[in-house]
């Protein structure tokens, strides 16, 4: 029988085969953020480089207006690193009535937006208190996991404070996804 | 028509199919670094275990002389974790005219070397200020992302200070890559 | 010849092809941990949500009693993030005869259990000293790498202190694996 050599030994019925090279994939890299207004209680979304340097999108995975657009349903591995940097956080030095302040923090959220669903879904969150005693500090937050996404879903990266994001190098702050 | 069951429903033309099990893959684990001199302003490269314990290379992905050699062009997921450890960083204690020192830092870079290209390319960087006040400190930096690589490319992991790398356990410090 | 379009150009012999969509995969999310006794020198294992919200298991990858069960041999990418949070660690403040205390620490270990092997194998470890000076602190540890697993292997996530794990949100603390 033709095609028999492709059949796995335990004779399960499989979904259609497809070549790996044509799967939707993207790796986006940091750019300097343009000043934009955002609501007080809403983390702003980062925008990204999608074609220069190390950045690319391929096989119908498109980047537009801070969003990665998911072109086909399936399980995706999604990842991001955001490097933050700032001057001393005063949380340990300024004490009110002898009580340490609530610490400053840095947060990254990878968010999914589905047009048919009113609320965005937080897929991944990395959050860290920052209470540094040196003069200036810098540190990355890395996230990555697998999610079942639907065609038309949109992904974005939100941060707690856009002004603390290190936009200086494409290898320090990035965002990517690929169909498994 | 024979083979029709392999054709995806939206009838796109695909690259040749290939079995996942034969794709180039490697997971390398930490070994104690041999004492070698390195240039002051250049981050030294780590060398790795490639066959004992959890470490392996397969399907033409080879490790030689601190480098992972990419045997075929394609999109690879590349990752590394380096655990650093050290005795107290003095940055918070030594103050000049009341001003905290520039903090110490730890940095990991995953670097690509292409023979036809004069300069190495930094693919991923994780960098963190270290200003610890306890007696000894330890912490990991994790990196991972997808890149389009060419046959013959070489990958290495560079660190800011080789003496701070925790080489004691294969699960603490590692480096890997696999073709998607 | 029928099926020729599936043959890769370098004419290697491949293992049987199989569709990506049927590969074993799981993404588990945090739940509040039930108080259980564990041995003093053994890190307790977390238990997980496997079907509500973002969590899922598919294609014979099953979750049972804190373990992910590996249904077929192959190379898997395994990942986890654990977000820890706690009140001030005093390690930098209490000094005995001018000597800083041993720092507190937080540790995540992804462990493999093979029934035919007496000892569990630590696949991945993320460990960090915690010596915070603010009033309360929080931070994630992320791990991810590729391992060759055998059918019947079991995976779990162990932590140094279960009471410090942030169980409040499914995007903060999670555990997953997928066959490559």
């Amino acid at each position: 029988l033709k095609g028999q050599e492709f059949a796995p030994s335990h004779q399960q019925v499989y979904a259609p085969l497809r070549a790996d090279g044509d799967k939707p994939r993207a790796h986006l890299t940091v750019v300097r953020q343009t000043p934009t207004q955002h609501f007080k209680n809403q983390f702003p979304a980062l925008h990204w480089e999608h074609e220069l340097g190390l950045a690319f999108t391929k096989n119908r995975m498109n980047y537009t207006n801070k969003f990665l657009l998911i072109p086909e349903s399936g399980d995706y591995f999604i990842y991001s690193q955001v490097t933050f940097r700032g001057m001393t956080s005063e949380c340990s030095e300024i004490r009110q009535a002898g009580r340490p302040n609530k610490p400053d923090s840095i947060t990254v959220v990878i968010t999914k937006v589905t047009d048919s669903y009113p609320e965005p879904t937080q897929l991944l969150m990395g959050t860290k208190s920052v209470c540094e005693v040196g003069s200036n500090w810098f540190q990355p937050i890395y996230l990555g996991a697998m999610f079942s996404l639907q065609e038309g879903d949109k992904l974005m990266v939100n941060v707690s404070d856009i002004s603390l994001v290190d936009y200086t190098k494409e290898d320090k702050t990035f965002f990517g996804a690929f169909l498994l | 028509l024979k083979g029709q069951e392999f054709a995806p429903s939206h009838q796109q033309v695909y690259a040749p199919l290939r079995a996942d099990g034969d794709k180039p893959r490697a997971h390398l684990t930490v070994v104690r670094q041999t004492p070698t001199q390195h240039f002051k302003n250049q981050f030294p490269a780590l060398h790795w275990e490639h066959e004992l314990g959890l470490a392996f290379t397969k399907n033409r992905m080879n490790y030689t002389n601190k480098f992972l050699l990419i045997p075929e062009s394609g999109d690879y997921f590349i990752y590394s974790q380096v655990t650093f450890r050290g005795m107290t960083s003095e940055c918070s204690e030594i103050r000049q005219a009341g001003r905290p020192n520039k903090p110490d830092s730890i940095t990991v870079v995953i670097t690509k070397v292409t023979d036809s290209y004069p300069e190495p390319t930094q693919l991923l960087m994780g960098t963190k200020s270290v200003c610890e006040v306890g007696s000894n400190w330890f912490q990991p930096i994790y990196l991972g992302a997808m890149f389009s690589l060419q046959e013959g490319d070489k990958l290495m992991v560079n660190v800011s200070d080789i003496s701070l790398v925790d080489y004691t356990k294969e699960d603490k410090t590692f480096f890997g890559a696999f073709l998607l | 010849l029928k099926g020729q379009e599936f043959a890769p150009s370098h004419q290697q012999v491949y293992a049987p092809l199989r569709a990506d969509g049927d590969k074993p995969r799981a993404h588990l999310t945090v739940v509040r941990q039930t108080p259980t006794q564990h041995f003093k020198n053994q890190f307790p294992a977390l238990h997980w949500e496997h079907e509500l919200g973002l969590a899922f298991t598919k294609n014979r990858m099953n979750y049972t009693n804190k373990f992910l069960l590996i249904p077929e041999s192959g190379d898997y990418f395994i990942y986890s993030q654990v977000t820890f949070r706690g009140m001030t660690s005093e390690c930098s403040e209490i000094r005995q005869a001018g000597r800083p205390n041993k720092p507190d620490s937080i540790t995540v270990v992804i462990t493999k259990v093979t029934d035919s092997y007496p000892e569990p194998t630590q696949l991945l470890m993320g460990t960090k000293s915690v010596c915070e000076v603010g009033s309360n602190w929080f931070q994630p540890i992320y791990l991810g790498a590729m391992f060759s697993l055998q059918e019947g292997d079991k995976l779990m996530v162990n932590v140094s202190d279960i009471s410090l794990v942030d169980y409040t949100k499914e995007d903060k603390t999670f555990f997953g694996a997928f066959l490559l």
Partner: antibody, heavy 119, light 111 residues
Amino acid sequence: QVQLVQSGAEVKKPGASVKVSCKASGYTFTSYDINWVRQAPGQGLEWMGWLNPNSGNTGYAQKFQGRVTMTADRSTSTAYMELSSLRSEDTAVYYCAREVPETAAFEYWGQGTLVTVSS
Amino acid sequence: QSVLTQPPSVSGAPGQRVTISCTSSSSDIGAALGVHWYQQLPGTAPKLLIEGYYNRPSGVPDRFSGSKSGTSASLTITGLLPEDEGDYYCQSYDGTLSALFGGGTKLTVLG
């Protein structure tokens, strides 16, 4: 209990080689690095290098590179240090020492082997 | 080449307190693994007294303590005993993970 027992004293001629052994007992030999340290008569301690008995990996002090070889026989839990092209200034007591993995301090020491280089 | 410098000799009467210093010529000495201290009594192999600046292995009396300040480490012996007489060495690692020993300090217990 942990013990490191070294081979006996040796007398060698200049230009020759010497191989000193260090037999370990009381612990899992492959789990700890072994270091070699020497001490010339009336002098201080001088580090020569380390050996990982599990992998066979080594790291040598720059001064001894090309002249020293450290090896292990896992079946007998024995570490070896061979020094070639001996000269009179290599006359010393040679110690093997087991490391603490976390700090790389030398926790357990052999009794020492006197190597005399004389024509 | 990095160097660890110790005083060639120190002395004290029984019951007294002595301190031996170990100063590094480079800031990267001890940054990773700290400074360790060894005691070598006449005719014997060295013995680990202090690891990582401060920590006493089990069996080492609490008369021995270690400390650190800037690029220096110190070993302090309180309640000196005649059997403490011998040589004391500090040891650390440089930036290439090569081990370094100080030149050693001869401790004499007077009287």
